[in-house]
Protein backbone atom coordinates (compact mmCIF):
# COMPACT_ATOMS: atom_id res chain seq x y z
CA UNK A 1 0.00 0.00 0.00
CA UNK A 2 1.74 3.25 -1.39
CA UNK A 3 2.24 5.53 1.57
CA UNK A 4 0.49 9.11 1.60
CA UNK A 5 2.61 12.17 0.26
CA UNK A 6 1.09 15.48 -0.08
CA UNK A 7 2.27 16.72 -3.06
CA UNK A 8 2.72 21.24 -3.59
CA UNK A 9 4.93 21.44 -7.00
CA UNK A 10 5.45 25.19 -6.67
CA UNK A 11 7.85 26.39 -4.35
CA UNK A 12 7.29 29.87 -5.20
CA UNK A 13 3.86 31.05 -6.99
CA UNK A 14 3.93 34.69 -8.03
CA UNK A 15 0.68 36.11 -8.25
CA UNK A 16 -0.54 39.93 -9.35
CA UNK A 17 -2.72 42.27 -7.45
CA UNK A 18 -6.40 41.54 -8.74
CA UNK A 19 -5.65 38.31 -10.17
CA UNK A 20 -6.55 35.01 -9.47
CA UNK A 21 -4.07 32.54 -7.91
CA UNK A 22 -3.95 28.96 -8.10
CA UNK A 23 -2.22 26.66 -5.38
CA UNK A 24 -1.51 23.39 -6.81
CA UNK A 25 -1.87 20.38 -4.25
CA UNK A 26 -2.11 16.01 -5.14
CA UNK A 27 -2.36 13.43 -3.13
CA UNK A 28 -0.59 9.97 -3.85
CA UNK A 29 -3.03 7.92 -2.25
CA UNK A 30 -7.13 8.15 -1.28
CA UNK A 31 -6.26 6.63 1.74
CA UNK A 32 -6.66 7.14 4.39
CA UNK A 33 -10.31 8.64 4.37
CA UNK A 34 -9.95 12.11 5.91
CA UNK A 35 -10.61 15.74 4.43
CA UNK A 36 -7.65 17.69 3.16
CA UNK A 37 -7.82 22.01 4.70
CA UNK A 38 -5.64 24.74 3.27
CA UNK A 39 -3.86 27.06 5.83
CA UNK A 40 -1.20 30.03 5.56
CA UNK A 41 1.19 29.82 7.42
CA UNK A 42 2.35 27.08 10.34
CA UNK A 43 2.13 26.35 13.83
CA UNK A 44 -0.86 27.54 16.21
CA UNK A 45 -1.70 30.73 14.57
CA UNK A 46 -1.84 29.28 10.90
CA UNK A 47 -4.86 30.75 9.26
CA UNK A 48 -7.37 28.36 7.83
CA UNK A 49 -7.56 29.07 3.95
CA UNK A 50 -10.17 26.59 3.03
CA UNK A 51 -12.02 23.94 4.92
CA UNK A 52 -14.83 21.91 2.52
CA UNK A 53 -16.94 21.79 5.82
CA UNK A 54 -16.85 24.22 7.57
CA UNK A 55 -16.47 28.09 7.21
CA UNK A 56 -17.38 30.81 4.50
CA UNK A 57 -14.64 31.05 2.15
CA UNK A 58 -15.89 33.33 -0.49
CA UNK A 59 -12.78 33.70 -2.86
CA UNK A 60 -12.22 29.91 -2.62
CA UNK A 61 -13.11 28.08 -5.49
CA UNK A 62 -11.74 23.91 -5.44
CA UNK A 63 -9.96 23.27 -9.16
CA UNK A 64 -11.47 19.91 -8.80
CA UNK A 65 -15.01 18.12 -8.05
CA UNK A 66 -14.20 17.20 -4.22
CA UNK A 67 -17.02 15.00 -4.36
CA UNK A 68 -15.92 12.64 -6.39
CA UNK A 69 -14.51 9.51 -4.13
CA UNK A 70 -11.22 9.18 -6.72
CA UNK A 71 -10.67 12.45 -6.83
CA UNK A 72 -6.69 13.56 -5.21
CA UNK A 73 -6.39 16.89 -6.74
CA UNK A 74 -7.18 19.50 -3.65
CA UNK A 75 -5.93 22.66 -5.40
CA UNK A 76 -7.74 25.43 -5.05
CA UNK A 77 -7.97 29.45 -6.39
CA UNK A 78 -8.19 32.80 -4.74
CA UNK A 79 -9.42 35.42 -6.33
CA UNK A 80 -8.90 39.30 -6.21
CA UNK A 81 -5.71 38.83 -4.84
CA UNK A 82 -4.37 41.42 -2.54
CA UNK A 83 -0.64 42.51 -0.92
CA UNK A 84 -2.50 40.70 2.05
CA UNK A 85 -2.58 37.36 0.58
CA UNK A 86 1.36 36.95 0.30
CA UNK A 87 2.63 34.00 2.81
CA UNK A 88 3.29 30.18 2.26
CA UNK A 89 0.52 28.39 2.10
CA UNK A 90 0.04 24.44 2.88
CA UNK A 91 -2.32 21.81 2.01
CA UNK A 92 -2.67 19.46 5.16
CA UNK A 93 -4.31 16.05 5.62
CA UNK A 94 -6.27 14.95 8.51
CA UNK A 95 -7.86 12.19 9.99
CA UNK A 96 -11.29 12.68 11.20
CA UNK A 97 -11.04 12.90 15.25
CA UNK A 98 -12.98 14.01 18.21
CA UNK A 99 -13.67 16.73 19.55
CA UNK A 100 -11.22 17.82 16.65
CA UNK A 101 -9.56 16.34 13.82
CA UNK A 102 -5.65 15.00 14.36
CA UNK A 103 -3.19 16.46 11.21
CA UNK A 104 -1.82 13.47 9.54
CA UNK A 105 0.37 14.53 7.10
CA UNK A 106 1.06 18.32 5.72
CA UNK A 107 2.40 19.34 2.20
CA UNK A 108 5.73 21.37 1.87
CA UNK A 109 3.98 24.90 1.33
CA UNK A 110 4.15 27.33 -1.91
CA UNK A 111 5.10 30.67 -0.79
CA UNK A 112 2.95 33.35 -2.39
CA UNK A 113 4.11 36.26 -3.62
CA UNK A 114 3.27 39.47 -4.99
CA UNK A 115 4.97 39.14 -8.62
CA UNK A 116 4.92 42.85 -10.81
CA UNK A 117 5.87 42.85 -14.37
CA UNK A 118 8.96 44.77 -15.55
CA UNK A 119 7.69 47.59 -17.99
CA UNK A 120 9.05 47.60 -21.38
CA UNK A 121 13.04 47.87 -21.46
CA UNK A 122 13.61 52.14 -22.93
CA UNK A 123 17.21 52.09 -24.52
CA UNK A 124 19.03 55.36 -25.20
CA UNK A 125 21.94 56.51 -26.87
CA UNK A 126 24.89 59.38 -26.93
CA UNK A 127 23.16 62.94 -26.87
CA UNK A 128 25.83 63.60 -29.74
CA UNK A 129 26.78 61.41 -32.65
CA UNK A 130 30.05 59.57 -32.87
CA UNK A 131 32.64 58.82 -35.69
CA UNK A 132 33.80 54.96 -35.92
CA UNK A 133 36.61 53.37 -33.85
CA UNK A 134 34.62 55.51 -30.57
CA UNK A 135 33.00 54.44 -27.78
CA UNK A 136 29.43 55.41 -27.04
CA UNK A 137 27.49 54.49 -23.68
CA UNK A 138 23.79 52.94 -24.32
CA UNK A 139 21.61 53.01 -21.30
CA UNK A 140 18.68 50.43 -21.06
CA UNK A 141 16.01 51.21 -18.21
CA UNK A 142 13.08 49.00 -16.82
CA UNK A 143 10.91 49.80 -13.80
CA UNK A 144 7.91 48.34 -11.12
CA UNK A 145 8.78 44.97 -11.44
CA UNK A 146 8.84 41.95 -8.49
CA UNK A 147 10.55 40.11 -7.21
CA UNK A 148 13.93 41.56 -7.55
CA UNK A 149 15.91 38.76 -9.40
CA UNK A 150 15.97 39.50 -12.84
CA UNK A 151 18.28 39.46 -15.87
CA UNK A 152 19.98 41.87 -18.52
CA UNK A 153 21.25 41.39 -21.63
CA UNK A 154 23.04 43.27 -24.32
CA UNK A 155 23.27 42.70 -27.66
CA UNK A 156 24.50 44.22 -31.20
CA UNK A 157 23.38 42.85 -34.00
CA UNK A 158 22.57 39.48 -32.54
CA UNK A 159 25.89 38.73 -30.71
CA UNK A 160 25.74 39.69 -27.18
CA UNK A 161 28.00 42.10 -25.47
CA UNK A 162 29.83 42.03 -22.25
CA UNK A 163 31.01 45.64 -21.79
CA UNK A 164 28.17 46.59 -19.35
CA UNK A 165 27.18 47.59 -15.99
CA UNK A 166 23.79 46.88 -14.50
CA UNK A 167 22.21 48.31 -10.96
CA UNK A 168 18.91 47.02 -9.13
CA UNK A 169 17.43 49.38 -7.35
CA UNK A 170 16.74 49.76 -4.25
CA UNK A 171 19.00 47.21 -2.47
CA UNK A 172 16.59 46.31 0.26
CA UNK A 173 13.12 44.79 0.29
CA UNK A 174 10.64 46.74 -1.89
CA UNK A 175 7.45 46.38 -3.58
CA UNK A 176 9.00 46.76 -7.04
CA UNK A 177 12.31 47.26 -8.36
CA UNK A 178 14.13 49.29 -11.12
CA UNK A 179 16.97 48.01 -13.14
CA UNK A 180 19.47 50.45 -15.09
CA UNK A 181 22.33 48.97 -17.32
CA UNK A 182 25.26 51.10 -19.53
CA UNK A 183 26.72 49.24 -22.14
CA UNK A 184 29.75 50.81 -24.01
CA UNK A 185 29.44 49.98 -28.02
CA UNK A 186 32.75 50.45 -30.13
CA UNK A 187 31.21 52.15 -33.42
CA UNK A 188 32.12 50.29 -36.47
CA UNK A 189 32.08 52.33 -39.91
CA UNK A 190 29.36 50.01 -41.09
CA UNK A 191 27.00 50.30 -37.96
CA UNK A 192 24.51 52.44 -40.00
CA UNK A 193 22.33 49.69 -39.96
CA UNK A 194 23.07 48.06 -36.70
CA UNK A 195 21.08 48.01 -33.72
CA UNK A 196 21.65 47.46 -30.17
CA UNK A 197 18.86 45.69 -27.83
CA UNK A 198 18.54 45.58 -24.38
CA UNK A 199 16.97 42.18 -22.91
CA UNK A 200 15.33 41.91 -20.13
CA UNK A 201 14.15 38.38 -18.30
CA UNK A 202 11.74 38.16 -15.59
CA UNK A 203 10.27 35.45 -13.29
CA UNK A 204 6.83 36.90 -14.55
CA UNK A 205 7.33 36.85 -18.46
CA UNK A 206 6.96 33.70 -18.22
CA UNK A 207 10.35 33.14 -20.36
CA UNK A 208 9.21 35.34 -23.04
CA UNK A 209 11.76 38.51 -22.19
CA UNK A 210 10.98 42.00 -23.41
CA UNK A 211 13.10 44.01 -25.57
CA UNK A 212 14.50 47.55 -26.01
CA UNK A 213 16.31 48.43 -28.86
CA UNK A 214 18.01 52.02 -30.54
CA UNK A 215 19.11 52.00 -33.99
CA UNK A 216 23.00 52.81 -34.20
CA UNK A 217 22.47 55.35 -36.84
CA UNK A 218 21.00 57.79 -34.19
CA UNK A 219 24.63 57.92 -32.44
CA UNK A 220 27.37 57.41 -35.84
CA UNK A 221 28.36 60.05 -37.38
CA UNK A 222 30.53 58.55 -40.81
CA UNK A 223 32.81 61.53 -41.95
CA UNK A 224 32.84 61.56 -45.60
CA UNK A 225 35.91 61.16 -48.27
CA UNK A 226 37.06 63.65 -50.89
CA UNK A 227 38.19 63.41 -54.39
CA UNK A 228 38.42 66.05 -56.87
CA UNK A 229 38.85 64.69 -60.32
CA UNK A 230 39.08 66.65 -63.92
CA UNK A 231 37.47 65.25 -66.60
CA UNK A 232 38.37 65.02 -70.35
CA UNK A 233 36.62 68.11 -71.84
CA UNK A 234 33.16 68.06 -73.37
CA UNK A 235 32.24 70.72 -74.90
CA UNK A 236 34.26 73.36 -76.23
CA UNK A 237 35.89 76.18 -73.88
CA UNK A 238 34.53 74.26 -70.86
CA UNK A 239 36.25 71.59 -68.23
CA UNK A 240 34.08 69.59 -66.24
CA UNK A 241 35.18 69.26 -62.49
CA UNK A 242 34.05 66.46 -60.41
CA UNK A 243 34.07 66.24 -56.63
CA UNK A 244 33.18 62.78 -55.22
CA UNK A 245 32.43 62.64 -51.63
CA UNK A 246 31.97 58.81 -50.46
CA UNK A 247 30.69 56.99 -47.37
CA UNK A 248 29.20 59.60 -45.22
CA UNK A 249 26.52 59.71 -42.53
CA UNK A 250 23.90 61.14 -41.78
CA UNK A 251 22.81 62.80 -45.32
CA UNK A 252 23.16 66.72 -43.39
CA UNK A 253 25.69 68.25 -45.86
CA UNK A 254 26.65 71.15 -47.36
CA UNK A 255 29.06 71.56 -50.91
CA UNK A 256 30.59 74.56 -51.84
CA UNK A 257 33.10 75.38 -55.19
CA UNK A 258 35.58 77.63 -54.83
CA UNK A 259 37.83 79.01 -57.63
CA UNK A 260 40.97 80.64 -56.76
CA UNK A 261 39.29 81.10 -53.36
CA UNK A 262 36.51 82.51 -54.49
CA UNK A 263 32.85 81.07 -53.79
CA UNK A 264 31.00 80.24 -56.94
CA UNK A 265 27.37 80.20 -56.89
CA UNK A 266 26.83 77.82 -60.04
CA UNK A 267 27.18 74.23 -59.81
CA UNK A 268 26.18 71.84 -62.69
CA UNK A 269 24.73 68.66 -61.39
CA UNK A 270 24.65 66.42 -58.54
CA UNK A 271 23.69 63.18 -57.42
CA UNK A 272 22.76 61.38 -53.77
CA UNK A 273 23.18 57.88 -54.01
CA UNK A 274 22.73 55.03 -51.06
CA UNK A 275 25.23 52.68 -50.44
CA UNK A 276 24.56 49.18 -49.01
CA UNK A 277 25.50 49.91 -45.39
CA UNK A 278 23.41 52.59 -45.02
CA UNK A 279 26.29 55.62 -45.71
CA UNK A 280 25.63 58.03 -48.91
CA UNK A 281 27.16 58.86 -51.61
CA UNK A 282 27.26 62.20 -53.34
CA UNK A 283 29.07 63.88 -56.69
CA UNK A 284 29.01 67.02 -57.60
CA UNK A 285 30.09 68.33 -61.07
CA UNK A 286 30.86 71.93 -61.82
CA UNK A 287 32.09 73.22 -64.95
CA UNK A 288 34.77 75.92 -65.69
CA UNK A 289 35.49 77.89 -68.48
CA UNK A 290 39.10 78.13 -69.58
CA UNK A 291 38.74 80.50 -72.37
CA UNK A 292 41.29 83.16 -71.76
CA UNK A 293 42.26 81.38 -68.74
CA UNK A 294 45.28 81.39 -66.82
CA UNK A 295 47.27 78.10 -66.19
CA UNK A 296 46.97 78.15 -62.20
CA UNK A 297 43.46 77.87 -61.61
CA UNK A 298 43.04 76.18 -58.20
CA UNK A 299 39.49 74.95 -57.54
CA UNK A 300 38.44 73.94 -54.15
CA UNK A 301 35.79 71.10 -53.00
CA UNK A 302 34.05 72.04 -49.63
CA UNK A 303 32.12 70.37 -47.62
CA UNK A 304 30.26 71.06 -44.09
CA UNK A 305 29.34 67.64 -42.78
CA UNK A 306 26.63 67.80 -40.18
CA UNK A 307 27.85 70.87 -38.76
CA UNK A 308 30.89 69.46 -38.37
CA UNK A 309 34.20 71.61 -39.07
CA UNK A 310 34.13 71.87 -43.08
CA UNK A 311 36.86 69.44 -45.00
CA UNK A 312 37.85 70.49 -48.38
CA UNK A 313 40.12 68.88 -51.50
CA UNK A 314 41.55 71.02 -54.07
CA UNK A 315 42.82 70.46 -57.68
CA UNK A 316 45.23 72.49 -59.64
CA UNK A 317 43.27 72.43 -63.70
CA UNK A 318 45.69 71.24 -66.34
CA UNK A 319 44.95 72.97 -69.20
CA UNK A 320 47.14 72.07 -71.57
CA UNK A 321 47.22 74.77 -75.18
CA UNK A 322 45.82 71.58 -77.00
CA UNK A 323 42.62 71.78 -74.81
CA UNK A 324 42.34 75.14 -75.51
CA UNK A 325 42.52 74.77 -78.77
CA UNK A 326 40.03 72.25 -79.22
CA UNK A 327 36.92 72.93 -81.21
CA UNK A 328 33.46 72.48 -80.08
CA UNK A 329 32.55 69.60 -81.44
CA UNK A 330 35.31 67.21 -79.45
CA UNK A 331 34.64 64.29 -78.08
CA UNK A 332 35.72 63.03 -74.30
CA UNK B 1 -13.58 -7.33 -1.70
CA UNK B 2 -14.42 -4.98 1.25
CA UNK B 3 -16.38 -7.20 3.52
CA UNK B 4 -17.67 -6.53 7.20
CA UNK B 5 -18.50 -9.82 8.90
CA UNK B 6 -20.54 -8.86 12.26
CA UNK B 7 -21.02 -11.64 14.88
CA UNK B 8 -23.48 -13.72 15.98
CA UNK B 9 -27.49 -12.94 17.23
CA UNK B 10 -27.45 -12.63 21.28
CA UNK B 11 -29.78 -12.82 23.44
CA UNK B 12 -29.33 -11.06 26.71
CA UNK B 13 -31.00 -10.26 30.09
CA UNK B 14 -31.53 -6.86 31.45
CA UNK B 15 -28.64 -5.11 33.05
CA UNK B 16 -26.34 -7.63 30.64
CA UNK B 17 -23.63 -6.45 28.60
CA UNK B 18 -22.66 -7.55 24.90
CA UNK B 19 -19.78 -7.55 23.01
CA UNK B 20 -20.33 -7.22 19.34
CA UNK B 21 -17.22 -7.93 16.65
CA UNK B 22 -16.79 -6.64 13.18
CA UNK B 23 -14.33 -7.95 11.23
CA UNK B 24 -13.08 -6.13 8.14
CA UNK B 25 -11.19 -7.44 5.39
CA UNK B 26 -10.50 -6.12 2.40
CA UNK B 27 -9.24 -3.22 3.53
CA UNK B 28 -6.88 -1.66 5.69
CA UNK B 29 -8.86 -1.27 9.40
CA UNK B 30 -6.47 1.82 9.70
CA UNK B 31 -7.64 3.64 6.86
CA UNK B 32 -11.07 3.87 7.63
CA UNK B 33 -13.28 4.84 10.37
CA UNK B 34 -16.24 2.73 11.52
CA UNK B 35 -19.74 3.89 12.68
CA UNK B 36 -21.87 1.82 14.47
CA UNK B 37 -26.09 1.76 14.25
CA UNK B 38 -28.46 0.31 15.48
CA UNK B 39 -32.47 -0.30 14.27
CA UNK B 40 -35.37 -1.27 16.64
CA UNK B 41 -37.71 -3.21 15.05
CA UNK B 42 -39.75 -1.65 12.76
CA UNK B 43 -38.25 1.18 13.55
CA UNK B 44 -35.68 3.87 11.53
CA UNK B 45 -32.02 4.05 11.91
CA UNK B 46 -30.24 5.41 15.34
CA UNK B 47 -26.64 6.49 15.36
CA UNK B 48 -24.66 4.65 18.16
CA UNK B 49 -20.97 5.87 17.79
CA UNK B 50 -17.85 6.12 15.58
CA UNK B 51 -14.43 4.54 15.76
CA UNK B 52 -11.46 6.24 14.07
CA UNK B 53 -9.52 3.44 12.46
CA UNK B 54 -6.51 5.44 12.96
CA UNK B 55 -6.11 5.94 16.37
CA UNK B 56 -8.78 4.40 18.36
CA UNK B 57 -10.58 8.00 19.33
CA UNK B 58 -14.19 7.67 19.80
CA UNK B 59 -17.23 9.84 19.72
CA UNK B 60 -20.59 8.48 21.23
CA UNK B 61 -24.29 9.17 20.87
CA UNK B 62 -25.49 11.39 24.11
CA UNK B 63 -27.99 8.88 25.22
CA UNK B 64 -25.39 5.85 25.46
CA UNK B 65 -23.07 7.78 26.58
CA UNK B 66 -21.53 5.64 29.32
CA UNK B 67 -22.49 2.70 28.55
CA UNK B 68 -21.52 2.20 25.24
CA UNK B 69 -17.22 1.77 24.46
CA UNK B 70 -16.42 0.94 20.88
CA UNK B 71 -12.59 -0.23 20.65
CA UNK B 72 -10.25 -1.54 18.00
CA UNK B 73 -7.92 -4.46 17.56
CA UNK B 74 -5.45 -3.58 14.00
CA UNK B 75 -3.65 -7.38 14.52
CA UNK B 76 -7.13 -8.85 13.81
CA UNK B 77 -8.67 -6.22 12.09
CA UNK B 78 -11.60 -6.19 14.25
CA UNK B 79 -13.63 -3.28 15.55
CA UNK B 80 -15.93 -3.85 18.88
CA UNK B 81 -19.11 -2.52 20.67
CA UNK B 82 -20.50 -3.06 24.01
CA UNK B 83 -23.32 -2.23 25.39
CA UNK B 84 -23.65 -2.40 28.65
CA UNK B 85 -26.46 -2.35 31.11
CA UNK B 86 -28.70 -2.96 28.95
CA UNK B 87 -32.45 -2.76 28.80
CA UNK B 88 -35.42 -4.13 26.97
CA UNK B 89 -35.28 -0.65 24.52
CA UNK B 90 -32.02 -1.97 23.58
CA UNK B 91 -33.01 -4.81 21.62
CA UNK B 92 -32.33 -4.22 17.99
CA UNK B 93 -30.22 -5.23 14.68
CA UNK B 94 -26.96 -3.59 15.75
CA UNK B 95 -24.63 -2.50 12.12
CA UNK B 96 -21.28 -1.92 11.80
CA UNK B 97 -20.35 0.91 8.69
CA UNK B 98 -17.38 1.96 7.11
CA UNK B 99 -16.72 5.52 6.77
CA UNK B 100 -16.35 5.79 3.04
CA UNK B 101 -14.67 9.66 1.88
CA UNK B 102 -14.07 12.57 3.68
CA UNK B 103 -17.92 12.93 2.98
CA UNK B 104 -18.66 10.42 6.05
CA UNK B 105 -20.99 8.67 4.03
CA UNK B 106 -21.34 4.59 5.44
CA UNK B 107 -20.32 2.54 1.98
CA UNK B 108 -19.88 -0.63 3.29
CA UNK B 109 -22.51 -2.12 6.10
CA UNK B 110 -22.11 -5.02 8.06
CA UNK B 111 -24.73 -7.81 7.92
CA UNK B 112 -26.12 -6.70 11.36
CA UNK B 113 -26.70 -8.40 14.94
CA UNK B 114 -29.17 -9.33 16.58
CA UNK B 115 -29.20 -8.38 20.16
CA UNK B 116 -32.98 -9.34 21.94
CA UNK B 117 -32.54 -8.28 25.89
CA UNK B 118 -35.60 -10.35 27.48
CA UNK B 119 -35.99 -11.60 30.80
CA UNK C 1 -28.04 18.50 17.06
CA UNK C 2 -29.20 18.42 13.62
CA UNK C 3 -32.43 17.32 13.24
CA UNK C 4 -33.23 15.62 9.77
CA UNK C 5 -37.09 15.62 8.58
CA UNK C 6 -38.12 13.32 6.32
CA UNK C 7 -41.13 13.44 3.85
CA UNK C 8 -43.53 11.82 3.28
CA UNK C 9 -42.98 8.85 5.83
CA UNK C 10 -44.45 6.47 3.33
CA UNK C 11 -45.99 6.57 -0.20
CA UNK C 12 -47.60 4.44 -2.99
CA UNK C 13 -46.29 4.40 -6.46
CA UNK C 14 -46.28 1.98 -9.72
CA UNK C 15 -43.70 0.70 -11.71
CA UNK C 16 -42.47 3.63 -14.34
CA UNK C 17 -43.20 6.81 -11.72
CA UNK C 18 -41.39 9.15 -11.07
CA UNK C 19 -40.75 9.37 -6.73
CA UNK C 20 -39.28 12.23 -5.07
CA UNK C 21 -38.36 12.14 -1.46
CA UNK C 22 -37.61 15.43 0.48
CA UNK C 23 -35.14 15.93 3.61
CA UNK C 24 -34.81 18.62 5.53
CA UNK C 25 -31.92 19.71 8.15
CA UNK C 26 -32.75 21.67 11.34
CA UNK C 27 -29.29 23.60 10.23
CA UNK C 28 -27.23 24.32 7.40
CA UNK C 29 -25.17 21.01 6.69
CA UNK C 30 -23.86 22.68 2.93
CA UNK C 31 -23.52 18.96 1.33
CA UNK C 32 -23.37 16.80 4.21
CA UNK C 33 -26.04 14.35 3.66
CA UNK C 34 -25.59 10.87 2.20
CA UNK C 35 -29.28 8.56 1.20
CA UNK C 36 -29.57 4.94 1.99
CA UNK C 37 -31.82 2.33 0.77
CA UNK C 38 -32.84 -0.40 3.14
CA UNK C 39 -34.84 -3.65 1.79
CA UNK C 40 -36.21 -5.51 4.97
CA UNK C 41 -34.00 -8.07 6.75
CA UNK C 42 -31.27 -6.06 4.91
CA UNK C 43 -28.70 -3.47 5.96
CA UNK C 44 -28.84 -0.64 4.19
CA UNK C 45 -27.12 0.43 0.90
CA UNK C 46 -25.31 3.60 0.00
CA UNK C 47 -26.97 5.58 -2.64
CA UNK C 48 -26.18 9.17 -3.00
CA UNK C 49 -23.36 10.97 -1.00
CA UNK C 50 -22.20 14.18 -0.71
CA UNK C 51 -25.92 15.58 -1.32
CA UNK C 52 -25.50 14.47 -5.25
CA UNK C 53 -22.70 11.79 -5.84
CA UNK C 54 -24.09 8.62 -7.28
CA UNK C 55 -22.28 5.59 -5.28
CA UNK C 56 -20.51 3.41 -7.91
CA UNK C 57 -22.96 0.63 -8.88
CA UNK C 58 -26.11 2.26 -8.18
CA UNK C 59 -28.19 3.05 -11.06
CA UNK C 60 -28.99 6.22 -12.72
CA UNK C 61 -32.31 6.73 -12.13
CA UNK C 62 -31.57 8.07 -8.86
CA UNK C 63 -29.79 11.46 -8.25
CA UNK C 64 -30.19 13.96 -5.14
CA UNK C 65 -29.98 17.37 -5.24
CA UNK C 66 -30.09 20.06 -2.77
CA UNK C 67 -27.36 21.99 -0.48
CA UNK C 68 -27.76 23.88 2.64
CA UNK C 69 -31.07 22.77 4.62
CA UNK C 70 -33.07 21.46 2.05
CA UNK C 71 -32.29 17.98 -0.07
CA UNK C 72 -33.97 16.03 -2.70
CA UNK C 73 -33.90 12.24 -3.46
CA UNK C 74 -35.26 11.56 -6.91
CA UNK C 75 -36.04 8.14 -9.06
CA UNK C 76 -36.81 9.13 -12.27
CA UNK C 77 -38.69 6.07 -13.21
CA UNK C 78 -39.51 3.31 -10.51
CA UNK C 79 -38.33 -0.13 -11.27
CA UNK C 80 -40.17 -3.32 -9.28
CA UNK C 81 -36.73 -3.42 -6.83
CA UNK C 82 -37.19 -0.20 -5.89
CA UNK C 83 -39.43 -0.80 -3.23
CA UNK C 84 -38.09 -0.24 -0.24
CA UNK C 85 -37.48 2.39 3.12
CA UNK C 86 -34.87 5.11 1.92
CA UNK C 87 -33.35 6.94 4.67
CA UNK C 88 -31.51 10.58 4.63
CA UNK C 89 -28.41 10.66 6.98
CA UNK C 90 -26.50 14.21 7.46
CA UNK C 91 -22.83 13.59 7.79
CA UNK C 92 -22.09 17.16 8.52
CA UNK C 93 -21.14 16.70 12.37
CA UNK C 94 -21.22 14.67 15.76
CA UNK C 95 -23.97 13.11 16.23
CA UNK C 96 -24.52 12.07 13.03
CA UNK C 97 -28.51 11.33 11.94
CA UNK C 98 -30.40 10.20 10.43
CA UNK C 99 -34.11 10.79 8.43
CA UNK C 100 -37.41 8.95 10.02
CA UNK C 101 -37.35 7.19 6.61
CA UNK C 102 -39.60 6.58 3.69
CA UNK C 103 -41.61 3.48 2.54
CA UNK C 104 -41.97 3.42 -0.75
CA UNK C 105 -45.16 0.94 -1.09
CA UNK C 106 -46.45 -0.47 -4.51
CA UNK C 107 -49.93 0.86 -5.57
Known amino acids: EEELQMIQPEKLLLVTVGKTATLHCTVTSLLPVGPVLWFRGVGPGRELIYNQKEGHFPRVTTVSDLTKRNNMDFSIRISSITPADVGTYYCVKFRKGSPENVEFKSGPGTEMALGAKPSAPVVLGPAARTTPEHTVSFTCESHGFSPRDITLKWFKNGNELSDFQTNVDPTGQSVAYSIRSTARVVLDPWDVRSQVICEVAHVTLQGDPLRGTANLSEAIRVPPTLEVTQQPMRVGNQVNVTCQVRKFYPQSLQLTWSENGNVCQRETASTLTENKDGTYNWTSWFLVNISDQRDDVVLTCQVKHDGQLAVSKRLALEVTVHQKDQSSDATP | QVQLVQSGAEVKKPGASVKVSCKAS????????INWVRQAPGQGLEWMGW????????NYAQKLQGRVTMTRDTSTSTVYMELSSLRSEDTAVYYC????????????WGQGTLVTVSS | DIQMTQSPSSLSASVGDRVTITCRAS??????LAWYQQKPGKAPKLLIY???SLESGVPSRFSGSGSGTDFTLTISSLQPEDFATYYC?????????FGGGTKVEIK
Open chain 2, 97 to 108: ARVGSSWEENDQ
Open chain 3, 89 to 97: QQTHSFPLT
Open chain 3, 27 to 32: QSISRW
Open chain 2, 51 to 58: ISGYNGNT
Open chain 2, 26 to 33: GYTLNNYD
Open chain 3, 50 to 52: AAS
